[in-house]
């Protein structure tokens, strides 16, 4: 049985302030059943960046077509990047439950923010 892989191909991404950042994440299987969420940082103090089902994330959009069937691409785009957005972002797969249980995290992508060229 092949184990589910959560793949974040870029270890780091550098973006100029004011630009958009794309954080890539794909999974190797549609199962186990359960959602994908994005966080900045690790551990109990991590910040939820994107969860499609609930919450309001005005600067974050899913890269893939929301009507695409059997999607395994959970990349996101964050617009209007500021220095405050710097950090390591993790794509995390959850197993469906009550509540959902964290199953596997990607290796993380470090976002660094360059000064906007004058």
């Amino acid at each position: 049985e092949e184990e589910l892989q959560v793949i974040q191909p870029e270890k780091s991404v550098s973006v100029a302030a004011g630009d958009s950042a794309t954080l890539n994440c794909t999974v190797s299987s549609l199962i186990p059943v359960g959602p994908i969420q994005w966080f900045r940082g690790a551990g109990p103090g991590r910040e939820l960046i994107y969860n499609l089902k609930e919450g309001h994330f005005p600067r974050v959009t899913a890269v893939s077509d929301p009507t695409k069937r059997n999607n395994m691409d959970f990349s996101i785009r964050i617009s209007n990047i500021t220095p405050a957005d710097a950090g390591t972002y993790y794509c995390v797969k959850f197993r469906k439950g009550s509540p959902d249980v964290e199953l596997k995290s990607g290796a993380g992508t470090e976002l660094s923010v360059r000064a906007k060229p004058s």
């Epitope: 589910l4 299987s29 199962i31 186990p32 059943v33 959602p35 994908i36 999607n71």
Partner: antibody, heavy 120, light 108 residues
Framework: DVQLVESGGGVVRPGESLRLSCAAS????????MSWVRQAPGEGLEWVST??????YYADSVKGRFTISRDNSKNTLYLQMNSLRAEDTAVYYC???????????????WGLGTLVTVSS | EIVLTQSPATLSVSPGERVTFSCRAS??????IAWYQQKPGQAPRLLIY???SRDTGIPDRFSGSGSGTDFTLTISSLQSEDFGVYYC??????????FGGGTKVEIK
């Protein structure tokens, strides 16, 4: 082409057991969730159970009596039904789950169904 | 558990007519609704998912709309092969997946 073929239905007495099988072909069986949905005679559709990898989900009406399982090496889905009741009488459909975007599951392919009759 | 209520229970329609089916959810299900068609003695067939996306091979006379709690399936011009029972299903919050009670389309 996706094909789902159920087997194992039949007539049993209340309290007895039955094992349904669903042979799948035409898609990468091992990466999809699979489900059983039933339909009592003249009634609507009722979801029974879903399996992901080793994660399983059941309707309250069958929890503790039915067990869903899969054998990816055989591309086969199973439903072990124990302690059968008259109200379990139905056509049992095997269905392939599909997801959209980042959302939950619906059923994009269905087998023709197998009839289970529980009667004394 | 989310309850889906379909109305009407039965529709008597002539071929060529426009047909509208309603599905109402007991709570917000966003756009996580699918529609199925079932003909007598056959398995259900997926028509629409994500409230408004047609499945592969489904004729464009079938369309879906709605979000939140109120959803509609429309057949713009009913064909003879469209008679049967139509079910909606929610997949926003499960288990359990739930289906509506169905709307039967009969020949007038």
């Amino acid at each position: 082409d996706v094909q789902l073929v159920e087997s194992g239905g039949g007539v049993v007495r209340p309290g007895e057991s039955l094992r349904l099988s669903c042979a799948a072909s035409g898609f990468s069986f091992s990466i999809y969730a699979m489900s059983w949905v039933r339909q009592a005679p003249g009634e609507g559709l009722e979801w029974v159970s879903t399996i992901g990898a080793d994660d399983t989900y059941y309707a309250d009406s069958v929890k503790g009596r039915f067990t869903i399982s899969r054998d990816n090496s055989k591309n086969t889905l199973y439903l072990q039904m124990n302690s059968l009741r008259a109200e379990d009488t139905a056509v049992y459909y095997c269905a392939k789950d599909s997801t959209v975007g980042w959302s939950g599951d619906f059923f994009d392919y269905w087998g023709l169904g197998t009839l289970v009759t529980v009667s004394s | 558990e989310i309850v889906l209520t379909q109305s009407p229970a039965t529709l008597s329609v002539s071929p060529g007519e426009r047909v509208t089916f309603s599905c109402r959810a007991s709570q917000n299900v966003r756009s996580d609704i699918a529609w199925y068609q079932q003909k007598p003695g056959q398995a259900p067939r997926l028509l629409i998912y994500a409230a408004s996306s047609r499945d592969t091979g489904i004729p464009d006379r079938f369309s879906g709309s709605g979000s939140g709690t109120d959803f509609t399936l429309t057949i713009s011009s009913l064909q003879s092969e469209d008679f049967g029972v139509y079910y909606c299903q929610q997949y926003y919050d499960w288990p359990p997946f739930t289906f509506g009670g169905g709307t039967k389309v009969e020949i007038k």
